[in-house]
Interface confidence: low
């Protein structure tokens, strides 16, 4: 008999277009489907109603899109999540699922023209109002400006209805004002629980004429390094010329909030041709602490403070580099990007994430599975290396230890970490599995990703699997759904997937097949894989001078800019003196910050796979419900469960 199934995101968002996938497996002829969305638990309101027909021509697969309106049923009540009932009627067969609703309407990105202001000056700021697809939306936004004590000093309710997704705003800072870090907080009126913010500094300052950069040769200090910590001081005028002057440099140890200065480390060094070098010797470091045991310093960090004075004495700039960790290994291994579950008897793809001590990704670090050194790989630019190991067909948990294999490091200096992977549970302990794998490359829009569908199953039933259904989740929505055909005898099938800007910043590919197993019961077999995409602009934008290269802009005169971008796009500009960033580099709105916010709002919760077919769907942010009784557990929380510390 046919199996009817519905798949939706396991969080549906108000006022957002959502997609639902409908399928009829082993069906004959046309199957009419009516989809209705009701309030829960009352079922008093029809929030949306759609109709479609699943036909043999479309392989009995289709989708409907619907939008849940923001009516008063969904007004936020503290501590109470809202749900809807999604119901699909296939002919006369009803399949329904209760789905969690998010009141979050989209994102707000706040940009100030500068990072630091003097009392009495004006803060120019703007708020980008976008939906989950990062397209402009017109909605009411609440804005607060808070002083360093967290007290709101200005509150506004603004509509971005006619602003094409940008609210241009300003605030005059009083002459008498609290110095320190101020905050702009904003949220959509419909979703007050989702607050977006940025900070700016208020301080009396004079713009410097040059910039000082303090850069250690390594991002960490290896505690047994006899050479000590080498640091380069670079000083340049803001227009590019190299500084000649003198630097006074002092080192110190930071332990949480506490700072211990190392007076013996104070040095006066010449800055010639824009740079100078200084070394904190290991002896000075150890002599500077009581009971100097090198091991006691591990886990603490070093800071370097440099004050550069021009030979003329006309200007002086102070700079600091802090948070240089004291370590026993220059690397850390993380399994945050590795699935927690494996399919027995199939490859297990370890996505080993290696970081430098400051948390940044470590590039070109060899890693290997301990005891299986033929399985070795190098980390890429994002710090991730893929290691595939062959697993045993037994249902035992796997304990896997990964080590770095950096030639310059001794065995003691290599980083090592162990993880445990659990076996995926099949329905009725069958031997039916699906493994999705992709090549580890830095994936960019415009490229094609080959997704491998690897099948392992009882040979007697193998011919029954004629297709896989695959679904792509991105930014909390079902971006794409399709079928991958499989011929009898094919263990490996490859799906070429064209990557577009829609796939940024990452996506999850979920696939499954269904069959009547040896026991006569309907079985669903699923897997998923999380894929990172290189963050880049969705549109194109180039800003350049509109004047010929030989005509340098002169103070007090006009200059022209040439802006190239997508037709119909709205462009907003900001001009700022570079000297501002010498004083404060924090809180700039960057592309990577935008993608980080989007990534954090992902409704999927793991790097792939799951404890069973239902876990695969749930962990990827999907619900699965069928007429044969298979279904995912009810998602009750908007946040992903936090792993135990």
């Amino acid at each position: 008999s046919p199996m009817y199934s519905i798949i939706t995101p396991n969080i549906l968002r108000l006022e957002s277009e959502e997609t639902m996938v409908l399928e009829a497996h082993d069906a004959q002829g046309d199957v009419p489907v009516t989809v209705t969305v009701h309030d829960f638990p009352g079922k008093k309101l029809v929030l949306s109603s759609e109709k479609t027909v699943l036909t043999p021509a479309t392989n009995h697969m289709g989708n409907v899109t619907f939008t849940i309106p923001a009516n008063r049923e969904f007004k936020s009540e503290k501590g109470r999540n809202k749900f809807v009932t999604v119901q699909a009627t296939f002919g006369t067969q009803v399949v329904e699922k209760v789905v969690l609703v998010s009141l979050q309407s989209g994102y707000l990105f706040i940009q100030t023209d500068k990072t630091i202001y003097t009392p009495g000056s004006t803060v120019l700021y703007r708020i980008f109002t976008v939906n989950h697809k990062l397209l402009p939306v017109g909605r009411t936004v609440m804005v607060n400006i808070e002083n360093p004590e967290g007290i709101p000093v200005k509150q506004d309710s603004l509509s971005s209805q006619n602003q094409l997704g940008v609210l241009p705003l300003s605030w005059d800072i009083p002459e008498l004002v609290n110095m320190g870090q101020w905050k702009i907080r904003a949220y959509y009126e419909n979703s007050p629980q989702q607050v977006f913010s940025t900070e700016f500094e208020v301080k009396e300052y004079v713009l410097p004429s040059f910039e000082v950069i303090v850069e250690p040769t390594e991002k960490f200090y290896y505690i047994y390094n006899e050479k000590g910590l080498e640091v380069t001081i670079t000083a340049r005028f803001l227009y590019g010329k190299k500084v000649e002057g003198t630097a006074f440099v002092i080192f110190g140890i930071q332990d949480g909030e506490q700072r211990i200065s190392l007076p013996e480390s104070l040095k006066r060094i010449p800055i010639e041709d824009g740079s100078g070098e200084v070394v904190l010797s290991r002896k000075v470091l150890l002599d500077g602490v009581q009971n100097p045991r090198a091991e006691d310093l591990v886990g603490k960090s070093l800071y370097v403070s440099a004050t550069v004075i021009l030979h003329s004495g006309s200007d002086m700039v102070q700079a600091e580099r802090s948070g240089i960790p004291i370590v026993t290994s220059p690397y850390q291994i993380h399994f945050t990007k590795t699935p927690k579950y494996f399919k027995p008897g199939m490859p297990f793809d370890l996505m080993v994430f290696v970081t430098n001590p400051d948390g940044s990704p470590a590039y070109r670090v060899p890693v290997a599975v301990q005891g299986e050194d033929t399985v070795q790989s190098l980390t890429q630019g994002d710090g991730v290396a893929k290691l595939s190991i062959n697993t045993h067909p037994s249902q035992k948990p796997l304990s896997i230890t990964v080590r770095t294999k950096k030639q310059e490091l001794s065995e003691a200096e290599q980083a090592t970490r162990t993880m445990q992977a659990l076996p995926y549970s099949t329905v009725g302990n069958s031997n039916n599995y699906l493994h999705l794998s992709v090549l580890r490359t830095e994936l960019r829009p415009g490229e094609t990703l080959n997704v491998n569908f690897l099948l392992r199953m009882d040979r007697a039933h193998e011919a029954k699997i004629r297709y896989y259904t695959y679904l792509i989740m991105n930014k909390g929505r079902l971006l794409k759904a399709g079928r991958q055909v499989r011929e009898p005898g094919q263990d490996l099938v490859v799906l070429p997937l064209s990557i577009t800007t829609d796939f940024i910043p990452s996506f999850r590919l979920v696939a499954y097949y269904t069959l009547i197993g040896a026991s006569g019961q309907r079985e669903v077999v699923a897997d998923s894989v999380w894929v990172d995409v290189k963050d880049s602009c969705v549109g194109s934008l180039v800003v350049k001078s509109g004047q010929s290269e030989d005509r340098q802009p002169v103070p007090g005169q006009q200059m022209t800019l040439k802006i190239e971008g997508d037709h119909g796009a709205r462009v907003v500009l900001v001009a700022v003196d570079k000297g501002v960033f010498v004083l404060n580099k924090k809180n700039k709105l960057t592309q990577s910050k935008i993608w980080d916010v989007v990534e954090k709002a992902d409704i999927g919760c793991t790097p792939g796979s799951g404890k069973d077919y239902a876990g695969v769907f749930s962990d990827a942010g999907l619900t699965f419900t069928s007429s044969s009784g298979q279904q995912t557990a009810q998602r009750a929380e908007l946040q992903c469960p936090q792993p135990a510390a």
Epitope: G345, M346, P347, F348, P366, A368, V369, Q370, G371, E372, D373, T374, V375, Q376, S388, I389, N390, T391, H392, P393, L398, I400, K405, E411, S437, N452, L454, R456, D491, L492
Partner: antibody
Framework: QVQVVESGGGSVQPGRSLRLSCAVS????????MNWVRQAPGKGLEWIGI???????NYASWAKGRFTISTDNSKNTVYLQMNSLRAEDTASYYC?????????????WGCGTSVTVSS | QLVLTQSPSASASLGASVKLTCTLS???????IDWYQQQPEKCPRYLMQ???????TKGTGVPDRFSGSSSGAERYLTISSLQSEDEADYYC?????????FGGGTKLTVLG
């Protein structure tokens, strides 16, 4: 009954190519990685390379470029393609299954196929 | 570089015991190794997997007379109550960074 049988050996002139086959039974290549190992007359065992489940390969440094391992899962057969053969490639060539995920032992082995390279 | 060193030959009398040694390069002394047997004109056969702490797992059909032990970088294969069919080449092997590595092998002669 788990079995590994090599074939395709013989005499060949230097500079020529030869493809060896390794037919497996009693298990699926879909679940296990396979190794090729050789043994020159009167000498010890020398590892050539491995093909993992899913087709990934790894070779001994000396074998890279001249030797290629591939599989045909539907035929349950592993191949070793040897190009630009030299006299020092004269040896018995063994195929062995890799078992275990932490440290893959080679078990079982075939009984080898003999290759002679001479003019 | 990962190297496994075996003495080229060993001999012992029928019914006696013999202990074959495989030494790992010092940087790799924690590695698990495998022992293989190759009887004259026969195919190689897996005997056991031996860990650094001395525990071992034998292959199917390997007699109880074969056992393994470890000390530091050294891995031992002990054969007690020697029989004529134990006369063979014995190889140790392990997975290294560049792939699988074999020791040079030890030729065991069973006397009289």
């Amino acid at each position: 009954q788990v079995q590994v049988v090599e074939s395709g050996g013989g005499s060949v002139q230097p500079g020529r190519s030869l493809r060896l086959s390794c037919a497996v039974s009693g298990f699926s290549l879909y679940n296990y990685a396979m190794n090729w190992v050789r043994q020159a007359p009167g000498k010890g065992l020398e590892w050539i390379g491995i093909i993992n489940v899913g087709g990934g390969t790894n070779y001994a440094s000396w074998a890279k470029g001249r030797f290629t391992i591939s599989t045909d899962n539907s035929k349950n057969t592993v191949y070793l393609q040897m190009n630009s053969l030299r006299a020092e490639d004269t040896a018995s060539y063994y195929c062995a299954r890799a078992v275990g995920y932490h440290h893959a032992r080679l078990d079982p082995w075939g009984c080898g196929t003999s290759v002679t390279v001479s003019s | 570089q990962l190297v496994l060193t075996q003495s080229p030959s060993a001999s012992a009398s029928l019914g006696a015991s013999v202990k074959l040694t495989c030494t790992l390069s010092s940087a790799h002394k924690t590695y698990t190794i495998d022992w293989y047997q190759q009887q004259p004109e026969k195919c190689p056969r897996y005997l056991m997997q031996l860990k650094s702490e001395g525990s071992y797992t034998k292959g199917t059909g390997v007699p109880d007379r074969f056992s393994g032990s470890s000390s530091g970088a050294e891995r031992y294969l002990t054969i007690s109550s020697l029989q004529s069919e134990d006369e063979a080449d014995y190889y140790c092997g392990t997975e290294g960074v560049g792939g699988y590595v074999f020791g040079g092998g030890t030729k065991l002669t069973v006397l009289g």
